[in-house]
Interface confidence: medium
């Protein structure tokens, strides 16, 4: 395993008052390998609402790097390959669980954290507000 | 908190050999609350690749309820509101980290698990395979 310089303020894993704390085996089990899912690997380029991936890094978090989808256009790509501004490219967002070292530098103490990430984009009909 | 009937085979949290195990505080911190993100709440209906949401529940998993997107059509909705089969509605998939009780029914022993979920759908140009 890894040897980490221990923060003297690290919580005691035997402390019965350690809030809502559980033991977690970090040997991540992957439930996906048998299902052989169809990957969304190249959809970011082929979509009518294409997106780019932007890097967000935080060394105190797992995963340390999260690539966020940012829609390339306000509108959507039409059949001619042009941007149609009568439609809107919008991000599809989803919360994911990440692990954060807490307190920082403690080798075996983490907090679960929810963060919102943009996974990709979809093309929607705009909501038109008519002014009376 | 929730009371779970304890499995007599539950690992001892003080067992130094408990594999690659750490303490995780489940008092989840939500980094999203201040950002007030624009929710993708009605995109599933307004998208040119609309989707339905299906509930997936598993009491041995945290979070126990996950909503899965299923694309409504093989094709995409065109400007006339009809399904255009020259385009494809495809699910945007992403992996999420979840906690699974392991062994089952242990109140404070979990394993990290990656599962693949469909978050929404996007409309893509199909890959056409030309037969020689």
């Amino acid at each position: 395993g890894i040897t980490i310089p221990r923060n003297p303020g690290c919580p005691n894993s035997e402390d019965k008052n350690f809030p809502r704390t559980v033991m977690v085996n970090l040997n991540i089990h992957n439930r996906n390998t048998n299902t052989n899912p169809k990957r969304s690997s190249d959809y970011y380029n082929r979509s009518t609402s294409p997106w780019n991936l932007h890097r967000n890094e935080d060394p105190e978090r797992y995963p340390s790097v999260i690539w966020e989808a940012k829609c390339r256009h306000l509108g959507c790509i039409n059949a001619d390959g042009n941007v149609d501004y009568h439609m809107n490219s919008v991000p599809i967002q989803q919360e994911i669980l990440v692990l954060r070292r807490e307190p920082p530098h403690c080798p075996n103490s983490f907090r679960l954290e929810k963060i919102l990430v943009s996974v990709g984009c979809t093309c929607v009909t705009p909501i038109v507000h008519h002014v009376a | 908190g929730i009371t779970i009937p304890r499995n007599p085979g539950c690992p001892n949290s003080e067992d130094k050999n408990f594999p690659r195990t750490v303490m995780v505080n489940l008092n989840i911190h939500n980094r999203n609350t201040n950002t007030n993100p624009k929710r993708s709440s009605d995109y599933y209906n307004r998208s040119t690749s609309p989707w339905n949401l299906h509930r997936n529940e598993d009491p041995e998993r945290y979070p126990s309820v996950i909503w899965e997107a299923k694309c409504r059509h093989l094709g995409c909705i065109n400007a006339d509101g009809n399904v255009d089969y020259h385009m494809n509605s495809v699910p945007i998939q992403q992996e999420i980290l979840v906690l699974r009780r392991e062994p089952p029914h242990c109140p404070n022993s979990f394993r990290l698990e990656k599962i693949l979920v469909s978050v929404g759908c996007t409309c893509v140009t199909p890959i056409v395979h030309h037969v020689a």
């Epitope: 395993g1 890894i2 970090l26 991540i28 990957r39 991936l53 797992y62 340390s64 | 690659r20 992996e95």
Partner: antibody, heavy 126, light 107 residues
Framework: EVQLVQSGAEVKKPGESLKISCKAS????????ISWVRQAPGQGLEWMGG????????DYAQKFQGRVTITADESTTTAYMELSGLTSDDTAVYYC???????????????????WGQGTTVTVSS | EIVLTQSPDFQSVTPKEKVTITCRAS??????LHWYQQKPDQSPKLLIK???HSNPGVPSRFSGSGSGTDFTLTINGLEAEDAGTYYC?????????FGQGTKVDIK
């Protein structure tokens, strides 16, 4: 820029053990994992296993299970690979390679090796 | 384990020519395929990650494409310094595996 510097060449006898170090500099050590890859003379690349520095979880290729141990020390930003029960088939160049902990396009997955050590030549001979 | 099969095993090419190397996976690996270049007595160097994304600093003549089981590395306008062995690598399912390599030399 991340740099990985490995320990020097080794000559071992069959049955002995080997421990190679890989010192990382540049970037945050816990933002990536370290994998070990070997290359026998005139052959291709073979993944042996890797460690996620963030929390020390390790994965080993089945072929090396029970014979290889991968560890890391965050205070010295150094990863180690120990291989026991050496035979002449273990004669190879051993590389450490950096593997980012990334959530890429919707996937938490093992990744590309974006930086490599210079390699450690290991000869096993009686 | 996933087997990656590269073709050709060897290619002798004239400078400025286009080079195409293919890598076929024994099962669907999405886009989790990466390409490396290794010159004699040197460590491998990452060229393309995730099938089509260039590693920073890699010349624009190198490009990658494909997803699922079939992938391609293209060198548009080979230069003398591109001689070496090229490997594909999948990181989708453990154990991570490499192709057997394609040796490219300059005529």
């Amino acid at each position: 820029e991340v740099q990985l510097v490995q320990s020097g060449a080794e000559v071992k006898k069959p049955g002995e053990s080997l421990k190679i170090s890989c010192k990382a500099s540049g970037g945050s050590f816990r933002s990536y994992g370290i994998s070990w890859v070997r290359q026998a003379p005139g052959q291709g690349l073979e993944w042996m296993g890797g460690i996620t520095n963030f929390f020390g979880a390790v994965d080993y290729a089945q072929k090396f299970q029970g014979r290889v141990t991968i560890t890391a020390d965050e205070s010295t930003t150094t990863a180690y690979m120990e291989l026991s029960g050496l035979t002449s088939d273990d004669t190879a160049v051993y590389y450490c390679a950096r593997e980012p902990n990334e959530f890429w396009n919707g996937y938490y997955t093992t990744h590309d090796f974006d930086a490599w050590g210079q390699g450690t030549t290991v000869t096993v001979s009686s | 384990e996933i087997v990656l099969t590269q073709s050709p095993d060897f290619q002798s090419v004239t400078p400025k020519e286009k080079v195409t190397i293919t890598c076929r996976a024994s099962q669907d690996i999405g886009a989790a395929l990466h390409w490396y270049q290794q010159k004699p007595d040197q460590s491998p160097k990452l060229l393309i990650k995730y099938a089509s994304h260039s590693n920073p600093g890699v010349p624009s003549r190198f490009s990658g494409s494909g997803s699922g089981t079939d992938f391609t590395l293209t060198i548009n306008g080979l230069e003398a310094e591109d001689a070496g062995t090229y490997y594909c690598h999948q990181s989708d399912i453990l154990p991570q595996t490499f192709g057997q390599g394609t040796k490219v030399d300059i005529k």
